[in-house]
């Protein structure tokens, strides 16, 4: 009996035409939502003039349906037992699940004004940038609609830059009509313990963003894991959103619509400083903002974002060091609301429910030659927004799953 079940599972989790896994893998049967909360700055003038603490108030959720598009360019390679694909990006606004419209306005950090002097530190260039910032009437903060902030707007300051660069700015620009990948993953045909594990991303086995082993692409994309998951296992996965591989550890057993699942959580250790977790030393790539690598809970992903000063954290700086959150007022980190988890069905290794939570922050530093930033007395890692991407197996699919998998085992 057990041998037969194991054989069936091993057959059905292989990523090839005709298996249960393949059908759900090509196009997820789960409805995935991405909720955004925007940090609306309450005292922009006070900050720019007096370098005060930044007072923020989160507004949301603003909800989009995502990951509804099927994988494309799916190509099996029978020689190395891999399958390659790209994942198209798309987002559809869901007004009924949102507190307002895409036209709602927010006061946020001026992304271009903050980023430009960080990228161009040459003093002559900063004099030029300053004149363009003034000419375009730009300042440290700006008011933008949700749609502009997320998906892009034509920046008035960048439009004056004296050579032809992209003048469109947005936290997720470009998104719609783009693809993530190419991913090449093991299909499990020759070795089921490697199924869904990423062999390469964008044609490379490393990211070229981090030194040493931090640069490795480890594990799967978190949508599934090799079958027969044990509680003692560390689940490793790669997230292109945060430009790194990360891991989850067993947290608890959960009953999900009658299916027993293991809840794996991202441990605080994953965001620790090298002092607390020496394994993280290669994620600390600069010494100043990180206070000589003693700060924790924020990840500088600038190398992955064309040199822009983008920092990723957990929402409300959960698990971050006090020096990071100290200059910001209005944050209320909460483990339940702000942590990331994966609910994995242990026999198949399928993720049946998940909540991915992360926060996008931008570093802004004092810049003597930039009038909009010259009054700042300290650097700030400014929260722009946080997101909660969730998916849960549908009732119908759950029933089917129970019948075909867990029911048979009982």
């Amino acid at each position: 009996g057990d041998m037969l079940i194991e054989k069936t599972i091993k057959r059905e989790v292989v990523l090839e035409e005709g298996t249960t896994a393949f059908k759900n893998w090509v196009k997820t049967g789960t409805t995935v939502y991405r909720q955004f909360w925007i940090f609306d700055v309450q005292n922009p003038d006070d900050v720019a003039k007096n370098s005060s603490k930044i007072k923020v108030k989160q507004r949301g959720p603003y909800t989009y349906r995502v990951r509804y598009l099927a994988k494309e360019n799916i190509t099996q390679d029978p020689e190395d037992h891999t399958v390659s694909f790209v994942q198209p990006n798309g987002a559809i606004f869901e007004p009924s699940l949102s507190v307002g419209t895409e036209d709602d306005n927010f006061t946020v950090l001026n992304l271009a004004v903050a980023a430009a002097p960080h990228i161009y530190q040459n003093s002559f260039v900063q004099v030029v940038l300053n004149s363009l910032i003034k000419k375009s009437k730009s300042s440290m903060f700006q008011t933008r609609s949700l749609k502009e902030l997320l998906w892009g707007y034509k920046d008035p300051f960048l439009s004056l830059v004296p050579y032809p660069i992209s003048t469109t700015v947005g936290v997720f620009y470009p998104y719609n009509d783009t693809v993530d990948g190419v991913y090449k993953v093991f299909n499990g045909k020759d070795n089921i313990s490697k199924v869904a594990i990423i062999e390469s991303y964008k044609g490379k086995r490393n990211l070229s963003y981090w030194p040493s082993y931090c640069d490795m692409i480890n594990g799967t994309d978190a949508a599934s894991f090799p079958p027969f998951v044990e509680k003692s296992r560390t689940l490793r996965f790669f997230s292109s959103d945060i430009c790194r591989s990360i891991y989850a550890v067993f947290g608890s057993e959960i009953d999900l619509k009658g299916i027993p699942v293991y809840r794996f959580v991202l441990p605080a250790n994953a965001f620790a400083s090298p002092l607390q977790n020496p394994d993280n030393h290669c994620f600390c790539t600069e010494k100043v903002i990180s206070n000589n690598c003693t700060s924790y809970g924020v990840l500088d992903i600038g190398k992955c974002k064309e040199g822009k000063p983008v920092y990723i954290s957990l929402p409300h700086f959960l698990h971050a060091s006090p020096d990071v959150s100290e200059p910001i007022e209005g944050l209320h980190p909460n483990e339940d609301e702000h942590r990331t988890y994966l609910d994995v069905e242990p026999i198949t290794g399928f993720t049946l429910q998940f909540a991915k939570r992360l926060q996008v922050n931008i570093l802004v530093k004092p810049a003597r030659k930039i009038e909009a930033l010259k009054n700042l007395k300290r650097p700030y890692i400014v929260p722009i927004l946080w997101l909660n991407e969730t998916g849960t197996i549908g009732d119908e699919k759950a029933e089917m799953f129970k019948t075909q998998v867990t029911g048979k085992i009982k």
Partner: antibody, heavy 115, light 108 residues
Framework: EEKLEESGGGLVQPGGSMKLSCVAS????????MNWVRQSPEKGLEWVAE??????????HYAESVKGRFTISRDDSKSSVYLQMNNLRAEDTGIYYC??????WGQGTTLTVSS | ENVLTQSPAIMSASPGEKVTMTCRAS???????LHWYQQKSGASPKLWIY???NLASGVPARFSGSGSGTSYSLTISSVEAEDAATYYC?????????FGSGTKLEIK
């Protein structure tokens, strides 16, 4: 203060090859598009080639007169930009400058193509 | 390609005089992408005016630039001896990038 130093010029016969190098300092080299511009008494200032950033997949552009013969490349770890020139012609003679255009230019290196 | 024609090719002026040199483009371009360089004898070119009218760092206020579309100019309100040089216009609007043939300013 930003500084650019070209090297590799000299005398070469028509049909020959030459590689010019340029080392930059005083600015974050990896953030700037880099160009080679040449100057001769006959043609004045003439743009030769441009290379963009890693984030632009090191996209390149060339003047029509050098397309297929010249190759621009960069090594951000060495703050250097290069110009590999093949099948050289007499009209390629001139002073070659490397520059991010809107910043300082180097002093140039002289290439003479002559038999 | 967008050909830039500068005139006059050579001009001479006495100290204190006002001088204007022009740069004409064969096709219209954004004023953001038209720049001027100064080159003194035996030296490499220096950015002088960027985006049609913005003076580069250290450029005296007697210099100014203006123009739009296909017609651009550089003006010196009161020429000084140190202004003797060749001035080139350059466009960064499209490829190939092009330079004008230069205007040589001599001081009497």
């Amino acid at each position: 203060e930003e500084k650019l130093e070209e090297s590799g010029g000299g005398l070469v016969q028509p049909g020959g090859s030459m590689k010019l190098s340029c080392v930059a300092s005083g600015f974050t080299f990896s953030n700037y598009w880099m160009n080679w511009v040449r100057q001769s008494p006959e043609k004045g200032l003439e743009w030769v080639a441009e290379i963009r950033l890693k984030s632009n997949n090191y996209a390149t552009h060339y003047a029509e007169s050098v397309k297929g013969r010249f190759t621009i490349s960069r090594d951000d770890s060495k703050s250097s930009v290069y110009l590999q020139m093949n099948n050289l012609r007499a009209e390629d003679t001139g002073i070659y400058y490397c520059t991010p255009l809107l910043l300082r230019w180097g002093q140039g290196t002289t290439l003479t193509v002559s038999s | 390609e967008n050909v830039l024609t500068q005139s006059p090719a050579i001009m001479s002026a006495s100290p204190g005089e006002k001088v204007t040199m022009t740069c004409r483009a064969s096709s219209s371009l954004s004023s953001t992408y038209l720049h001027w360089y100064q080159q003194k004898s035996g030296a490499s070119p220096k950015l002088w005016i960027y985006s049609t009218s913005n003076l580069a760092s250290g450029v005296p206020a007697r210099f100014s630039g203006s123009g739009s579309g296909t017609s651009y100019s550089l003006t010196i309100s009161s020429v000084e001896a140190e202004d003797a040089a060749t001035y080139y216009c350059q466009q960064y609007s499209g490829y190939p990038l092009t330079f004008g043939s230069g205007t040589k300013l001599e001081i009497k």
